[in-house]
Amino acid sequence: QAGPLPKPTLWAEPGSVISWGNSVTIWCQGTLEAREYRLDKEESPAPWDRQNPLEPKNKARFSIPSMTEDYAGRYRCYYRSPVGWSQPSDPLELVMTGAYSKPTLSALPSPLVTSGKSVTLLCQSRSPMDTFLLIKERAAHPLLHLRSEHGAQQHQAEFPMSPVTSVHGGTYRCFSSHGFSHYLLSHPSDPLELIVSGSLEDPRPSPTRSVSTAAGPEDQPLMPTGSVPHSGLRRHWE
């Protein structure tokens, strides 16, 4: 007897972090035997959507013409073949930005820091929030997060970096969010360029240099003072 149908692959284009009002396409790829594709969204009545396969029947397109809060969340897809329904795909987390006003990102004591010294990136929001996220452009694991303990809401979060090396240099943005939906983020802060000077391997780095995507300090959980470590956002959500 044949085993369970292989699970399909689920992804989003142009990506899984979408600004409010922008379009996004969710793709589910199964097998050539697929007769129907179904998309389910966690914590919502099912089925979320159903589509007939596109030729040659091994995938289906689920279109979101304008991103809103209703569409943010965690999705899985399935396909139906003549022998039944497939296993669910791995989850896709669709995040919407623009749900709240943008926070302010600053560096203390300065965005120009000497290698080996310490710097703290400070993300501040106008209204109290309970989750703050720091993103570094082109990092291998760009999302780092700091959540208030016990759901307490606050206006800022500190992301300390010590000791700083040249790998910490680059462009950062931060977001804020409420705990009731991890999938709704604020507008992004204005970018902050962190410039690391004085290191032997990179004495005068250019602010516009590309940032390495190899594992480095930016890939490690930052350790906020007096709080538990916070890990990559995806690991936290799952």
């Epitope: 389910d40 969204k41 919502s44 009545p45 099912a46 089925p47 979320w48 959507d49 159903r50 209703d70």
Partner: nanobody
């Protein structure tokens, strides 16, 4: 062939209760979110409640705490229990079926003919 058939509408006093039923064909019921819309004279159609094949429900803000929705898989039927009825609940109530995203877009795939609910003393 009529695929969604509503029943249970009528005249009820303010504060009273009513239970609407919708019978569906098995093929529609087994693979769709089932729900209820309503439309009052001169107003837009609005989603009242919906329930998925996974049992999860969505209740409209205007009826939260007063209306509940349930589905009976053995009878291919969905029910809307309406309590603490108000004059503003007066409308034609429509049974609907489709994927949930169609409910968000106010365009389910299947519609019933509607049943009148009038709340008046």
């Amino acid at each position: 062939e009529v695929q969604l058939v509503e029943s249970g509408g009528g005249l009820v006093q303010p504060g009273g209760s009513l239970r609407l039923s919708c019978a569906a064909s098995e093929s529609i019921f087994s693979s769709n979110v089932m729900g209820w819309y309503r439309q009052a004279p001169g107003k837009q159609r609005e989603l009242v409640a919906a329930v998925g094949i996974n049992g999860l429900t969505k209740i409209g803000d205007s009826v939260k705490g007063r209306f509940t929705i349930s589905r009976d898989n053995a009878k291919n039927s969905v029910y809307l229990q309406m309590n603490s009825l108000r004059a503003e609940d007066t409308a034609v109530y429509y049974c609907a079926a489709g994927a949930y995203v169609r409910f968000l877009q106010n365009s389910p795939d299947y519609w019933g003919q509607g049943t009148q609910v009038t709340v008046s003393s």
